[in-house]
Every structure is written in structure tokens, then in C-alpha cells.
Interface confidence: low
């Protein structure tokens, strides 16, 4: 698998992963003890014709372009988790490891 | 995990399966032996806010905004694979399972 | 076989418009980038930009931004780079030519196929 | 933008001869570098892609080399018919960028 790495100065427009910093207090969410922040990315971009995607099946639709399909959009394929300290709804200090948070790499699907 | 199943007479308009049948044959993709076609599947509809979202992370990047972040958008979260035979690039005959050519279900992410 | 067809030479005064029609047959037209590259009598390649027509985004280089627009027709297989604002240092011939990808990197593509050329004369 | 710096501009040579045409980038562009052949009024032909592939059809006696900055087509044995301008194209990131072209001559 592969994925395009791109940062605010790039002109790639294609299907790219852009970092992006997540504020927790910024956002008012004070449940959330540690981290106050952390890095989590984005994916942004056009999916052109095969370029990146994961599955043959992307392929196919585009193909076969029934009624709706949208063509391939720039989506996570890999994702990985961050550990977080939080309050849970009963106001109990949860320690626990929070799956997808990150956004690892981008592509078309 | 949820998601919704369509047809082609359905009225909803958000993230949703609906069927399609993948013809090799149509596609002049005649190195395919077997099948000569498949239901395959695709995913199709509108992602509003919060909707079938796979990921916790689709929710924060849609609060944090970032430039060029278009939101989720409509594709598979679970797929299978199928059984193929299939002459490769040195026209050997293979039989082989070819992985994430049907769609399961559909999210936003 | 893949081919595209140019429209024939133009002669424009300066600060008119010309709109270069490139015809593609024997691939699906949606489904590949057409890139618009020019080349001054004499000189060098200069790429203008790209379009996908199967959602008409296109990207322009920044040097053509303001004067350039690029089309597609998919009912016809055809695209089109127009051009205003014409000044004598736009007399080129222009070529549009088919972006090839064959893999999954972001290099992986080459141009395979290319037009003919339109001479597009500008003179007072 | 990146700027590509093509030398010689011009090259004169015989049937037969080993010829290497350079092209740097002003910046890293990874590998993502195609060669072209352009012949009097004709349009460019795509040689080499990705630095060192050849495109399907083209002559074993071309090939590319490099990666970063540094790049180099080298014709093996020239034919009458090599006798062209060639190009090269950065496409790691808009605008894509040509470089002023090399024209080589019969000697």
C-alpha cells in the first residue's frame, strides 16, 4: 500500500494525507484530561481514475458506472489508535487505548 | 457497525449498498475465466454529519475544519473477497481468492 | 487505436480568444487526465495544465490562470483549451496529450498519446 | 516552481556513438522524471518514465538513471533516426515543469 504525504504549501491535488492538529480544549471538550491535543491528519484530494486505490472493486464500479456511483473519494486506509485518559458518563477516569484516531495513510475508494 | 441496504427504487437519499453486478465480459476483460460475473456492490448516498461514521476521527476533523477537508463521503467499511480463476501476465492459468471485491456494508468516513 | 485529432491552425488578433478542440477516440474519455502543453516557434515545452473530464476538475499552471479555461464534452470525446487574452508571445503550437496511469504511485503515469498540435498565430 | 537545467543544450555526434544527456532538478523530485524525443514538427514521444522506465515499444538503447536531482539519458548506440531534441519532465508537483531541451546533432 502507498499514500501521498502533503503539507499546506503543496500542489498536489490529488488524493493527499495533510496533517492536522486536533484541540480538545479548542473544541470545548472537557472531558477529555490527556491529551489536550494530538496530531491526526486528514485526507483531501481527487481521486482520479486508479490513482490509489485500495481495492480492484473501485475499479469495477467506475466501469460498470451505474446510477449514483460517485467515482472513488479520498478516504483513510489506514488508521491507527492513540492512548487517552478521559471521564467516562459516570464520571469515572477511563485509561484506554482509542482506535482510528490517526490517520496513517489516504486513498480512493 | 450499521448500514443501510438499497435498491434501485429506493428513496433514501444518504450513505447506502446498493446492488450491482460486475459483467467481465461487458468489460472485455476476457483473461477472466471464472466468474464471468459477480454481484459486487456499491456504495452511494449523501454523508450528513454524524451518519454511519466509522470512525471517531471523521467527527473531529469535521469540527476542526481544515482546509480542502470535503467530509466524509460515502464508501465500503467491509468488503470480502471472491474465488477467481484468471489467466495472470504470462498466461498461466491461476485460481486464486481475490480480496475486497464485494461490498458488505457502507459507512461515511 | 488511441488516438486525438487537433483542430486545424488559427490566426487571431491580439487580445482575442481561441479555443483548441482535441478529439479522443479509441479509449474511454473519462477515465484518463488530458493535459494542454504549448511550444513557442523555436523554443521549449511548456505544460498549461490538465483536466479530468470524467468530474471536469483541472488544475492550471499558475502562469495561464487568469487567461486559460479548460473543457471537456464527454458526449463528443472531446477537449478544449481556450485561451484569452491573446498577445504575440502566444503564438505556439499547442498540443493536448493523454495522461497514462498504469499503476498506483504518484509518478506512475506517462503521456502515451498526443495530438497533432494546433499553430495558433497571433498578429496584428 | 522547479526549475529543470538541461545540459549540454546542444550535442553533436556520430552513428554509433554513446551519448548522456543530464537534466537536474532545483529541488528533490524523488523519481518522478520522464524523458521525451521531439523531432521537427512533430509532437514530443514519451521514452522514459519514473527515471528509468522504459515505455512500452521504445528501443532497449535508451534508458534513465537517478534520482533527487541528478538525472541521465543515455543513448547506447545512436541511429540516424536518434537525431532529435529531447526533454526532460519533472511531474512530482505542479506546475510540471520541462527542461529547455537538448538537441542533438549529427557530427
Known amino acids: 500500500d502507498f499514500g501521498l504525504d502533503c503539507d499546506e504549501h503543496s500542489t498536489e491535488s490529488r488524493c493527499c494525507r495533510y496533517p492536522l492538529t486536533v484541540d480538545f480544549e479548542a473544541f470545548g471538550w472537557d472531558w477529555i484530561i490527556a491529551p489536550k491535543r494530538y496530531k491526526a491528519n486528514y485526507c483531501s484530494g481527487e481521486c482520479e481514475f486508479v490513482f490509489l486505490q485500495k481495492y480492484p472493486h473501485t475499479h469495477l464500479v467506475h466501469q460498470a458506472n451505474p446510477r449514483g456511483s460517485a467515482g472513488p473519494c479520498c478516504t483513510p486506509t489506514k488508521m491507527s489508535p492513540i492512548n487517552m485518559l478521559y471521564f467516562n458518563g459516570k464520571e469515572q477516569i477511563i485509561y484506554g487505548k482509542i482506535p482510528a484516531m490517526v490517520v496513517d495513510r489516504c486513498g480512493c475508494s | 457497525d450499521f448500514g443501510l441496504d438499497c435498491d434501485e427504487h429506493s428513496t433514501e437519499s444518504r450513505c447506502c449498498r446498493y446492488p450491482l453486478t460486475v459483467d467481465f465480459e461487458a468489460f472485455g476483460w476476457d483473461w477472466i475465466i471464472a466468474p464471468k460475473r459477480y454481484k459486487a456492490n456499491y456504495c452511494s448516498g449523501e454523508c450528513e454529519f454524524v451518519f454511519l461514521q466509522k470512525y471517531p476521527h471523521t467527527h473531529l476533523v469535521h469540527q476542526a475544519n481544515p482546509r480542502g477537508s470535503a467530509g466524509p463521503c460515502c464508501t465500503p467499511t467491509k468488503m470480502s473477497p471472491i474465488n477467481m480463476l484468471y489467466f495472470n501476465g504470462k498466461e498461466q492459468i491461476i485460481y486464486g481468492k481475490i480480496p475486497a471485491m464485494v461490498v458488505d456494508r457502507c459507512g461515511c468516513s | 487505436q488511441v488516438q486525438l485529432v487537433q483542430s486545424g491552425a488559427e490566426v487571431k488578433k491580439p487580445g482575442a480568444s481561441v479555443k483548441v478542440s482535441c478529439k479522443a477516440s479509441?479509449?474511454?474519455?473519462?477515465?484518463?487526465?488530458m493535459h494542454w502543453v504549448r511550444q513557442a516557434p523555436g523554443q521549449g515545452l511548456e505544460w498549461m495544465g490538465n483536466?479530468?473530464?470524467?468530474?471536469?476538475?483541472?488544475n492550471y499552471n499558475q502562469r495561464f490562470k487568469a487567461r486559460v479555461t479548460m473543457t471537456t464534452d464527454t458526449s463528443t470525446s472531446t477537449a478544449y483549451m481556450e485561451l484569452r487574452s491573446l498577445r504575440s508571445d502566444d503564438t505556439a503550437v499547442y498540443y493536448c496529450?493523454?495522461?497514462?496511469?498504469?499503476?498506483?504511485?504518484?509518478?506512475?503515469?506517462?503521456?502515451?498519446?498526443w495530438g497533432q498540435g494546433t499553430l495558433v498565430t497571433v498578429s496584428s | 516552481d522547479i526549475q529543470m537545467t538541461q545540459s549540454p543544450s546542444s550535442l553533436s555526434a556520430s552513428v554509433g556513438d554513446r551519448v548522456t544527456i543530464t537534466c537536474k532538478a532545483s529541488?528533490?523530485?524523488?523519481?518522478?522524471l520522464s524523458w521525451f524525443q521531439q523531432k521537427p514538427g512533430k509532437a514530443p514521444k514519451s521514452l522514459i518514465y519514473?527515471?528509468?522506465r522504459l515505455v512500452d515499444g521504445v528501443p532497449s538503447k535508451f534508458s534513465g538513471s537517478g534520482s533527487g536531482t541528478d538525472f541521465t539519458l543515455t543513448i547506447s548506440s545512436l541511429q540516424p533516426e536518434d537525431f532529435a531534441t529531447y526533454y526532460c519532465?519533472?511531474?512530482?508537483?505542479?506546475?510540471?515543469?520541462f527542461g529547455q531541451g537538448t538537441k542533438l546533432e549529427i557530427k
Open positions: 519532465l519533472q511531474c512530482d508537483e505542479f506546475p510540471l515543469t
Open positions: 519514473r527515471a528509468n
Open positions: 496529450a493523454r495522461r497514462y496511469y498504469y499503476g498506483t504511485g504518484p509518478a506512475d503515469w506517462y503521456f502515451d498519446v
Open positions: 529541488q528533490d523530485i524523488n523519481s518522478y
Open positions: 483536466i479530468y473530464p470524467y468530474n471536469g476538475v483541472s
Open positions: 479509441g479509449y474511454s474519455f473519462t477515465g484518463y487526465f
